[in-house]
Interface confidence: low
């Protein structure tokens, strides 16, 4: 693995894709989504230590300033780098419709 | 302001653009950047309470699951929605060069 992908905090502790099983009720969607009734939500969770999956120059700056001023500048944060589309069957005024959401499930993660 | 822009935690506490004054030494750039010698770094700092500047559907999901499982799922995080370009004068083996970085200074912020 590249240096930027090796977690210095130990396996699984750094920013990576996690799957969280959720019902429509958990998501607050029960009143407008018909299907699926359960979703395997992929999201980005974990710490962002120095040089780990840095998204860009801004992330590098943020980490350097965080080390200097930890009370002022937070560490970079683990967020989606891209998303997988997902189709929901939704209720509409006239019936139901299929709607594709491009920004619902995280596909991979980085630190910003 | 839209509901998503009104901070329920009080003025200035939620996710927004901050400016942090930093030297080349602070940024760790002293050995490869000639100019500017100081940078007004704009970055995204602040809390992401429910419905505040939610970037997308994923952010909504994350907040709902964070409320249900706060030990497992972190709250959404304040990150750049877009960036401003910045030109650096860099040292090279043969002299100096101008380099534009598109991902260095945050332009506006949202919660993901």
């Amino acid at each position: 693995a590249r240096n930027g992908d090796r977690c210095p905090l130990g396996p699984g502790r750094c920013c990576r894709l996690h799957t969280v099983h959720a019902s429509l009720e958990d998501l607050g969607w029960a009143d407008w989504v018909l299907s699926p009734r359960e979703v395997q939500v992929t999201m980005c969770i974990g710490a962002c230590p120095s040089q780990f999956r840095e998204a860009n120059m801004h992330a590098q700056i943020k980490m350097n300033l965080h080390r200097l001023k930890p009370d002022t500048v937070p560490a970079p944060c683990c967020v989606p780098a891209s998303y997988n589309p997902m189709v929901l069957i939704q209720k509409t005024d006239t019936g139901v419709s299929l709607q594709t959401y491009d920004d619902l499930l995280a596909k991979d993660c980085h630190c910003v | 302001a839209r509901n998503g822009d009104r901070c329920p935690l009080g003025p200035g506490r939620c996710c927004r653009l901050h400016t942090v004054h930093a030297s080349l030494e602070d940024l760790g750039w002293a050995d490869w950047v000639l100019s500017p010698r100081e940078v007004q770094v704009t970055m995204c700092i602040g809390a992401c309470p429910s419905q505040f500047r939610e970037a997308n559907m994923h952010a909504q999901i994350k907040m709902n699951l964070h409320r249900l499982k706060p030990d497992t799922v972190p709250a959404p995080c304040c990150v750049p929605a877009s960036y401003n370009p910045m030109v650096l004068i860099q040292k090279t083996d043969t002299g100096v060069s101008l380099q534009t970085y598109d991902d260095l200074l945050a332009k506006d912020c949202h919660c993901v």
Partner: antibody
Framework: DVKLVESGEGLVKPGGSLKLSCAAS????????MSWVRQTPEKRLEWVAY????????YYADTVKGRFTISRDNARNTLYLQMSSLKSEDTAMYYC????????????WGQGTTLTVSS | DSVLTQSPASLLVSLGQRATISCRAS??????????MHWYQQKPGQPPKLLIK???YLESGVPARFSGSGSGTDFTLNIHPVEEEDAATYYC?????????FGGGTKLEIK
């Protein structure tokens, strides 16, 4: 336009094997669950197998469990049904269908491909 | 498994009249909010075509003379007024849980 085109039809002896394919186009194949549904000569419709969009959830009708294998290649936009230990009661028209998710409906069907199992 | 029983097996209806097809499930295919029952139309030499989803929601492009109702174990497909092009076999199908099953079909003829 959504298009599902089945292929692989054949006449097979009892105990034999056959693989059906379904080429999908006109939609983002990797976002949709898919199923195979068959129609017997008596015109009864039978759901055969289901595969989720990513291929991680698979379900079979009891009548084919252990003999049929559903799979997909999202890079090739293709759905497959590998059939083995075939019986005369497997004789049917096999339809490739788009199923969306586990509790949805079949919103698109292919034209079907015929399997005849006979000695 | 939920067994779906359709009745009648065949139906002869005059042009412009109402056709009513019943589908009974051996156990509930509904939740507190939705019924996972769908209806299809099949004409000779063609694959089935989705008409109604979740018991009562008309699929896009399907004429408004088709309607569906019911919950729990009893569901109905109505066609009114019947037109010549509606001559076909109609199937119900549930997706409440696996295995998904279909009804035996109802053949509608127009006189």
């Amino acid at each position: 336009d959504v298009k599902l085109v089945e292929s692989g039809e054949g006449l097979v002896k009892p105990g034999g094997s056959l693989k059906l394919s379904c080429a999908a186009s006109g939609f983002t194949f990797s976002s949709y669950a898919m199923s195979w549904v068959r129609q017997t000569p008596e015109k009864r419709l039978e759901w055969v197998a289901y595969i989720s969009s990513g291929g991680d959830n698979i379900y079979y009708a009891d009548t084919v469990k252990g003999r049929f294998t559903i799979s997909r290649d999202n890079a090739r936009n293709t759905l497959y049904l590998q059939m083995s230990s075939l019986k005369s009661e497997d004789t049917a028209m096999y339809y490739c269908t788009r199923a969306l998710v586990e509790n949805a409906y079949f919103d698109y069907w292919g034209q079907g491909t015929t399997l005849t199992v006979s000695s | 498994d939920s067994v779906l029983t359709q009745s009648p097996a065949s139906l002869l209806v005059s042009l412009g009249q109402r056709a009513t097809i019943s589908c009974r499930a051996s156990k509930s295919v509904s939740t507190s909010t939705y019924s996972y029952m769908h209806w299809y139309q099949q004409k000779p030499g063609q694959p089935p075509k989705l008409l109604i989803k979740y018991a009562s929601y008309l699929e896009s492009g399907v004429p408004a003379r088709f309607s569906g109702s019911g919950s729990g174990t009893d569901f109905t497909l109505n066609i009114h007024p019947v037109e010549e092009e509606d001559a076909a076999t109609y199937y119900c199908q549930h997706s409440r849980e696996f295995p998904w099953t279909f009804g035996g079909g109802t053949k509608l003829e127009i006189k």
